[in-house]
């Protein structure tokens, strides 16, 4: 991390543009020139964390599945009594089969009725949802995509005309600073422009603004 960035973090007011020291700083400064640079997580650590999260998720899913199995078992044990065939004669077994078949038929009837109710409810929900959309004037939410964008472009997009003033003010501040540190920055020139050019930000910015 560049020394200037840690100083900037301690400053209450906007810090001056840092002196060119390390090329790895550029992208960070281009996107967040006045914020403290966050420490980067190494790829191996990222992978480790991802694996850990996946493991936790897997364990959670397994636990949920186990809970569901247990719940199903409990439900079945209350609904389906164990077969107590010891000592029952052929007559009783036949009778029992008839009883169980009758029970199955009854459960099937109940299941059919419940399915009919569910279907009716689904249809009603669909109708009501449609009515809600009709009342909203058939408004459709746009699908949001992640866009890589510079802070300035974002400001411009969010604030519109007011952002222009903010940008001009920033440019003015830079000019004042430039006079103070002209020697140091002569080689660098306008570092923001350089970075925008390097990262293709200028083109993106124009596209975004248009």
């Amino acid at each position: 991390m560049a020394d200037g960035s840690s100083d900037a973090a301690r400053e209450p007011r906007p810090a001056p543009a840092p002196i060119r020291r390390r090329s790895s700083n550029y992208r960070a400064y281009a996107t967040e020139p006045h914020a403290k640079k966050k420490s980067k997580i190494s790829a191996s650590r990222k992978l480790q964390l991802k694996t850990l999260l996946l493991q936790i998720a897997k364990q959670e899913l397994e636990r949920e599945a186990e809970e569901r199995r247990g719940e199903k078992g409990r439900a079945l044990s209350t609904r389906c009594q164990p077969l107590e065939l010891a000592g029952l004669g052929f007559a009783e077994l036949q009778d029992l089969c008839r009883q169980l078949h009758a029970r199955v038929d009854k459960v099937d009837e109940e299941r059919y009725d419940i399915e009919a109710k569910v279907t009716k409810n689904i249809t009603e929900i669909a109708d009501l949802t449609q009515k809600i959309f009709d009342l909203r004037g058939k408004f459709k939410r746009p699908t949001l995509r992640r866009v890589r964008i510079s802070a300035d472009a974002m400001m411009q997009a969010l604030l519109g005309a007011r952002a222009k003033e903010s940008l001009d003010l920033r440019a003015h501040l830079k000019q004042v600073k430039k006079e103070d540190t002209e020697k140091e920055n002569r080689e660098v020139g306008d570092w923001r422009k350089n970075i925008d050019a390097l990262s293709g930000m200028e083109g993106r910015k124009k596209k975004f603004e248009s």
């Epitope: 009594q81 164990p82 107590e84 029952l88 052929f90 007559a91 036949q94």
Partner: antibody, heavy 120, light 113 residues
Framework: EVKLEESGGGLVKPGGTLKLSCAAS????????MSWVRQTPEKRLDWVAT????????FYPDSVKGRFTISRDNARNTLYLQMNSLRSEDTAMYYC?????????????WGQGTLVTVSA | DIVMTQSPSSLAMSVGQKVTMSCKSS????????????LAWYQQKPGQSPKLLVY???TRESGVPKRFKGKGKGTKFTLTISSVQAEDLADYFC?????????FGAGTKLELK
């Protein structure tokens, strides 16, 4: 030695209720299906009710269905017969009987019986 | 319901004689899957409770003397006492264990001459 001992019989008026008990010993009560069988004064034998080893399955003839209830308490090794809305034709000697082993058939053991008299 | 018909209703025999009693069912008691006939025979001596003699139409219960022999299949069954003894004086009932309601025959009374 298998022993079945009925109790609870007596004289009751038509429409009355009575609860018979059968205390079992000499075998693993909870492993066997049990039944009540009655014998009329004319010596005719009538099957009254059957209950499975754990009490989940119950069987009755139409003549007593809805009036009589068979139950068991495996912890106490006792079989019960709750008799409601008694009629004069229910007058009989009531026997509790243990079913045979699963690979066999018939009522292997019978108690000495308890007499139920339904009369005004 | 399966109706069980026993005959004769009573018979008088002398000790040592052979006796045969009959039991007919209104429908077959044969379970085709195991080829077993679900019929039992019981003996009830005066003042006592019934005692199982034979099950599956021909299988003697343990402890039952060999003189008692059950036969038959389908709807026709017999119980034969090869040599009647004084202690055999009793009522004999057949019972079907094929379907509910379980039903008994009216019985055959064995008396001694």
């Amino acid at each position: 030695e298998v022993k079945l001992e009925e109790s609870g019989g007596g004289l009751v008026k038509p429409g009355g209720t009575l609860k018979l008990s059968c205390a079992a010993s000499g075998f693993t009560f909870s492993s066997y299906a049990m039944s009540w069988v009655r014998q009329t004064p004319e010596k005719r034998l009538d099957w009254v009710a059957t209950i499975s080893s754990g009490g989940s399955y119950i069987f009755y003839p139409d003549s007593v269905k809805g009036r009589f209830t068979i139950s068991r308490d495996n912890a106490r090794n006792t079989l019960y017969l709750q008799m409601n809305s008694l009629r004069s034709e229910d007058t009989a000697m009531y026997y509790c009987a243990r079913h045979h082993n699963p690979d066999k058939s018939g009522f292997a053991y019978w108690g000495q019986g308890t007499l139920v008299t339904v009369s005004a | 319901d399966i109706v069980m018909t026993q005959s004769p209703s009573s018979l008088a025999m002398s000790v040592g004689q052979k006796v045969t009693m009959s039991c007919k069912s209104s429908q077959s008691l044969l379970n085709s899957s195991n080829q077993k006939n679900y019929l039992a025979w019981y003996q009830q001596k005066p003042g006592q409770s019934p005692k199982l003699l034979v099950y599956f139409a021909s299988t003697r219960e343990s402890g039952v003397p060999k003189r008692f022999k059950g036969k038959g299949k389908g709807t026709k069954f017999t119980l034969t006492i090869s040599s009647v003894q004084a202690e055999d004086l009793a009522d004999y009932f057949c019972q079907q264990h094929y379907s509910t309601p379980l039903t008994f025959g009216a019985g055959t009374k064995l008396e001694l001459k």
